[in-house]
């Protein structure tokens, strides 16, 4: 429906509070280096303008698009050229090119200081004295570090953040109450950001069709009782929501997400028996709950897939009449029967089936040609099954930290050109798959493992895209979305790599190592391990294990010494020399 004023329309739909929060998130995701106060000023100016449009939709400039209004506002920032360099050139462009330009300048790894958590009392005082500013600062800090964070979901996180402070700042032991909650929110936030980053990458790099296919698989698994047309209705609306959020249209995105939640709750009977509890919650919780709802039970009367997709005499006729609809139905039917498969595997199966039909429907005996098509799926299914079995066995044998090390060695040998911080971050996240998925029941393991790995490998892809250094990474990241994980799994040791020259500084440690948290110590050790592999790519796992054990013993010894710094200075070079010998 056409509205005289888009900004007034969204202000009225969303309400002032959500409107302001979403504009703050949008601006923070675009201008990631701007100070908080500058953003607050811009948000207040936009909000005051929106109110004039609500009062009179025909008022001056109220008919302008949101991109025009927001872009004009961003381009008033005085220090744009000094702070952002060539991003300032975006302001010379007209819409829609200007917005596209801003999107291209979003930085997945902005040069921002790590967030330091103040003392609990300091945080509680700030929360109690200036609650609104405190919560808006949270939105700003998360949004600028995660420029693709799913905006309506970030408002949900802010609500949880507020609830944690409201409860814990009253508690007898504030820290014991608050810190675990903040840790959990941080971890959930990082996971949410990474999942959304994959959605945006799917849309931006592989197009709407790829995203819709993935969504059909997931929604069909969740709502196996729903009719195909209901699944595609939800998928179509979901695609619109994510296209908007990934494109920076956060007000439209949040508004449409609320509409989708409303539709789903009004049509529970056609979708799933699992939505009832979600639908009783207020908006932000409701949308979050619907997005994470468990799979409904499969209908009992599902007939064999082969009836319609192998045995039927009309397979080629139906395929030829409407290829996209036929393939959509195949994906829906297969997915609703297989909650135990990963979405990526289901997409590979659909791709294989389509390729077989393309080939067979052009032959004299199509049925004879595609009769065994489902048998051809077997190796595709066994690949992720073996991946899960092998990696969960390793995880159970090693535990998370050593499993991360195993993956770090594996990936450093595959793509040694990638920067050490990226290899460490990605391998640590890959290793968390064990903790997250290996304890799950058999039927949930594969979707958990492979779809989680897809999210983590996408982090590697987006970080690598910023500064490409490896053709092999580029190839795996760009050739096929559904085959990214198998592509990385199939990479062997890079035999063309010339070992990195030894740099003593890389392997020099100081007493500050002893004051680091366990996590920070692990990162230090894993950084050294990656550098070691880059220096000695032919080293065996046994050799590396020995060196790492010696290294752990060295750190433990020096951290217990009276003169820690002297110990590090004396014992460090000895360890390096011994390691050189062990790896020769």
């Amino acid at each position: 429906d056409a509205h005289k004023s888009e900004v007034a329309h969204r202000f009225k739909d969303l309400g002032e509070e959500h409107f302001k929060d979403l504009v703050l998130v949008a601006f923070s995701q675009y201008l990631q280096q701007c100070p908080f106060e500058e953003h607050l000023k811009l948000v207040n100016e936009v909000t005051e303008f929106a109110k004039t449009c609500v009062a009179d939709e025909t008022a001056e400039n109220c008919d302008k698009s949101l991109h025009t209004l927001f872009g004009d506002k961003l381009c008033t920032v005085a220090t744009l050229r000094e702070t952002y360099g060539d991003m300032a050139d975006c302001c010379a462009k007209q819409e829609p090119e200007r917005n596209e330009c801003f999107l291209q300048h979003k930085d997945d790894k902005p040069d921002l200081p790590p967030l330091v958590r103040p003392e609990v009392d300091v945080m509680c005082t700030a929360f109690q004295e200036h609650e609104d500013t405190f919560l808006k600062k949270y939105l700003y800090e998360v949004a600028r570090r995660h420029p693709y964070f799913y905006a309506p979901e970030l408002l949900f996180f802010a609500q949880k953040y507020k609830a944690a402070f409201t409860e814990c700042c009253q508690a007898a032991d504030k820290g014991a109450c608050l810190l675990p909650k903040l840790d959990e929110l941080r971890d959930q936030g990082k996971a949410s950001s990474a999942k959304q980053r994959l959605k945006c990458a799917s849309l931006q790099k592989f197009g709407e069709r790829a995203f819709k296919a993935w969504s059909v698989a997931r929604v069909s698994q969740r709502f196996p009782k729903a009719d195909f047309t209901e699944v595609t209705k939800v998928v179509t609306d979901l695609t619109k929501v994510h296209t908007e959020c990934c494109h920076g249209d956060l007000l439209e995105c949040a508004d449409d997400r609320a509409e989708l939640a409303k539709y789903m709750c009004e049509n529970q009977d056609s979708l799933s028996s699992k939505l009832k509890e979600c639908c009783e919650k207020p908006l932000l919780e409701k949308s979050h709950c619907l997005a994470h709802v468990e799979n409904d039970e499969m209908p009992a009367d599902l007939h064999a897939l082969t009836d319609d997709y192998v045995e039927s005499k009309d397979v080629c006729k139906n395929y030829a009449e409407a290829k996209d609809v036929f393939m959509g139905m195949f994906l829906y039917e297969y997915s609703r029967r297989h909650p135990d498969y990963s979405a990526m595997l289901l997409l590979r199966l659909a791709k294989a089936y389509e390729a077989t039909l393309e080939k067979c429907c052009a032959t004299a005996d199509p049925h004879g040609c595609y009769a065994k098509v489902f048998d051809e799926f077997q190796p595709l299914v066994e690949d992720p099954q073996n991946l899960v079995k092998h990696n969960c066995e390793l995880f159970e044998q090693f535990g998370e930290y050593k499993f991360q090390n195993e993956l770090l060695v594996r990936y450093t040998k595959k793509v040694p050109q990638v920067s050490t911080p990226t290899l460490v971050e990605v391998s640590r996240n890959l290793g968390k798959v064990g903790t997250k998925c290996c304890k799950q029941p058999e039927a949930k393991r594969m979707p958990c493992v492979e779809d989680y790995l897809s999210v983590v490998l996408n982090q590697l892809c987006v970080l690598h895209e910023k500064t490409p250094v490896s053709d092999r990474v580029t190839k795996c990241c760009t050739e096929s979305l559904v085959n990214r994980r198998p592509c990385f799994s199939a990479l062997e040791v890079d035999e063309t790599y010339l070992p990195k020259a030894f740099n003593a500084e890389t392997f020099t440690f100081h007493a500050d190592m002893c004051t680091l948290s366990e996590k920070e110590q692990q990162v230090k050790k894993q950084t050294a391990l990656a550098e070691l592999v880059k220096h000695k790519p032919k080293a065996t796992n046994e050799q590396l294990k020995t060196v790492m054990e010696d290294f752990a013993a060295f750190v433990e010894k020096c951290c217990k010494a009276d003169d820690k710094e002297a110990c590090f200075a004396e014992e460090g070079p000895k360890l390096v020399a011994a390691s050189e010998t062990a790896l020769a």
């Epitope: 195909f228 047309t229 595609t232 209705k233 609306d237």
Partner: nanobody, 117 residues
Framework: EVQLLESGGGLVQPGGSLRLSCAAS????????MGWVRQAPGKGREWVSL????????YYADSVKGRFTISRDNSKNTLYLQMNSLRAEDTAVYYC??????????WGQGTLVTVSS
């Protein structure tokens, strides 16, 4: 009892347009996906288009994509098919049909569309 009554067929020249209508009764129209199916002389039935109850999601056979537009007015219990750039191969009896999960379970009597110069 479910009733579907098509209208709007007729003779049209190649490149011309027609709009078919289908009046539905005997069921809760806005709860069901609806569609159009056609049968050319001497041929089998061919699916043409589908529309979700909300009217916001549509599906088309590849042969009509970009030329035909399906729509519905739930307040009038009516289904439409706007046919543009008609070709001789579009000549057929067009049936309005009600969709139930995976198949069409009810059909109208059909309306004849003839594309000829």
């Amino acid at each position: 009892e479910v009733q579907l009554l098509e209208s709007g067929g007729g003779l049209v020249q190649p490149g011309g347009s027609l709009r078919l209508s289908c009046a539905a009764s005997g069921f809760t129209f806005n709860h069901y996906t609806m569609g159009w199916v056609r049968q050319a002389p001497g041929k089998g039935r061919e699916w043409v288009s589908l529309i979700h109850p909300s009217g916001t999601v549509t599906y088309y056979a590849d042969s009509v994509k970009g030329r035909f537009t399906i729509s519905r007015d739930n307040s009038k219990n009516t289904l439409y098919l706007q046919m543009n750039s008609l070709r001789a191969e579009d000549t057929a009896v067009y049936y309005c049909a009600k969709w139930e999960k995976k198949y069409f379970d009810y059909w109208g009597q059909g309306t004849l569309v003839t594309v000829s110069s």
